[in-house]
């Protein structure tokens, strides 16, 4: 006569995180008397998942009516699957005794959990950098499974090639993380630019996740200065303007010096914005020529975004 067999028909089962996993198990006989137990893993450290005889297993339900007289189906459903539930599950028949003894085990079913990666988080350098400099951006995404994942970098829709990516851990794990660093060369036109990290994974059904960084938070475009003398507005008065062009960000302080002495300090307020996102600003100084006996050196000194000041001078001729 044939001895009881424990049949686990599925070698592997893959389930999305949050869903329920059904693990199939049937026995070929009701002999011997004794419970079915489900375990995750094998050996002394195996974890009890369900015991037909006793215990409370809130996430586990039996697929068939386990108390039914003829029942030989001991398939279970585990609800709200997380990556931590991944592993090999064994359906084990025990023989009634004091204590119950293991009689026969099924071959096991490997449960793999498909978990979506978290939304990629892109972070740039701590300090701003100027055009022509290379800056690094990092992209991180966590909690995905299986390990296979694709990460791409884009700048304004153009794919970048200078990046390095690591998926951790290297060995088997319930879930994984990806970390990538991309190098980007800044240009003066990058105020409106975006760097995008795109993550594609089997759980996303062809709809990748994206993380974005605006280069406006990374770039500093230093201003160009031009000081010009305007036609005389009134007798003994000369209007001198300082054109501050193509700067970003807006934080800018301008100081006028007459022969090295501070005449006036002001902060950029009513700026005009260029198409590329940089700003222009103009400051003017009304110089009373009659107050000067000699030529005057006028200096427009600009401190932009906390950087060392840049300046432009203009010599004002005072006629005898």
């Amino acid at each position: 006569e044939e001895e009881l067999q424990v049949i686990q028909p599925d070698k592997s089962v893959s389930v999305a995180a949050g869903e329920s996993a059904i693990l199939h198990c049937t026995v070929t006989s009701l002999i011997p008397v004794g419970p079915i137990q489900w375990f995750r893993g094998a050996g002394p450290a195996r974890e009890l998942i369900y015991n037909q005889k006793e215990g409370h297993f809130p996430r586990v339900t039996t697929v068939s009516e386990s108390t039914k007289r003829e029942n030989m189906d001991f398939s279970i459903s585990i609800s709200n699957i997380t990556p931590a539930d991944a592993g090999t599950y064994y359906c084990v028949k025990f023989r009634k005794g004091s204590p119950d003894t293991e009689f026969k085990s099924g071959a096991g079913t490997e449960l793999s959990v498909r978990a979506k990666p978290s939304a990629p988080v892109v972070s740039g350098p701590a300090a701003r950098a100027t055009p022509q400099h290379t800056v690094s951006f990092t992209c991180e995404s966590h909690g995905f499974s299986p390990r296979d994942i694709t990460l791409k970098w884009f700048k304004n829709g153009n794919e970048l090639s200078d990046f390095q990516t690591n998926v951790d851990p290297v060995g088997e794990s319930v879930s994984y993380s990806i970390h990538s660093t991309a190098k980007v060369v800044l240009t003066r036109e990058d105020v409106h630019s975006q760097v995008i990290c795109e993550v594609a994974h089997v759980t996303l059904q062809g709809d990748p996740l994206r993380g974005t960084a605006n280069l406006s938070e990374t770039i500093r475009v230093p201003p160009t200065l031009e000081v010009t003398q305007q036609p005389v507005r009134a007798e003994n008065q000369v209007n001198v303007t300082c054109q501050v062009r193509k700067f970003y960000p807006q934080r800018l302080q301008l100081t006028w010096l007459e022969n090295g002495n501070v005449s006036r300090t002001e902060t950029a307020s009513t700026v005009t914005e260029n198409k590329d996102g940089t700003y222009n600003w103009m400051s003017w100084l009304l110089v009373n020529v009659s107050a000067h006996r000699d030529d005057v050196k006028l200096t427009c000194q600009v401190e932009h975004d906390g950087q060392p000041a840049v300046s432009k001078s203009h010599d004002l001729k005072v006629s005898a």
Epitope: E3, V33, R69, K96
Partner: antibody, heavy 115, light 111 residues
């Protein structure tokens, strides 16, 4: 689906008897067959269960004197060293207890031990 | 071995009465629920009513119910019918395979 016992009868003290329990309408291969007896005017008494070769067991009082075997359609119980107190109706039932209770039952066969 | 004590040993009741029979085990039954109830009428084989302490067997009327866990169990007939006059046995299972013991029986007679 039923069980039919046979093999009962009159036997002398110290004698032996082989009882049969034949299934019709279902197979015994995936179930145990349990034996229960009832002395005249008394209650039910569990004797033992016949599963596969390895999984056959008897109540402590029946060990040694009673043995059993089974095919896919018939279960057997050998009674030996019979005594007058073994006089009873012997029932077979499908099942091994706990989640496999005794059901259905045969109609019973009377064993009388007397000289 | 497990010992099953049934009470009462007999009772008289009328049709429509609610009848309760108890069964006490000398130790906790296997899995706290290895307890079945059987009905036997004169000259017939026993018939399964309840198993796993509270599971109604197929084809058994819903007026029969079982309850209890561990050592104390009850069979209730909510409204006694003429065909229910019979002897009722509990069968308890201990921790070992062969440790199955019937109670001494409760005879339900017509008052």
């Amino acid at each position: 689906r039923q069980l039919v016992e046979s093999g009962g009868g009159l036997v002398q003290p110290g004698g032996s008897l082989r009882l049969s329990c034949t299934a019709s309408g279902f197979s015994l291969s995936s179930h145990g067959i349990s034996w229960v007896r009832q002395a005249p005017g008394k209650g039910l008494e569990y004797i033992g269960t016949i599963g596969t070769g390895v999984i056959t067991y008897f109540a402590s009082w029946a060990k040694g004197r009673f043995t059993g075997s089974k095919t896919s359609s018939t279960a057997y119980m050998e009674l030996s060293s019979l005594r007058s107190e073994d006089t009873a109706v012997y029932f077979c039932a499908r099942g091994s207890a706990w989640n496999d209770p005794f059901d259905p039952w045969g109609q019973g066969t009377l064993v009388t031990v007397s000289s | 071995d497990i010992v099953m004590t049934q009470s009462p040993s007999s009772l008289s009741a009328s049709v429509g009465d609610r009848v309760t029979i108890t069964c006490q085990a000398s130790q906790s039954v296997y899995g706290n629920n290895d307890l079945a109830w059987y009905q036997q009428k004169p000259g017939q084989a026993p018939k399964l009513l309840i198993y796993l302490a509270s599971t109604l067997a197929t084809g058994v009327p819903s007026r029969f119910s079982g309850s209890g866990s561990g050592t104390d169990f009850t069979l209730t007939i909510s409204s006694l019918q003429p065909e229910d006059f019979a002897t009722y046995y509990c069968l308890g299972g201990g921790d070992d395979e062969a440790d199955n013991t019937f109670g001494q029986g409760t005879k339900v007679e017509i008052k």
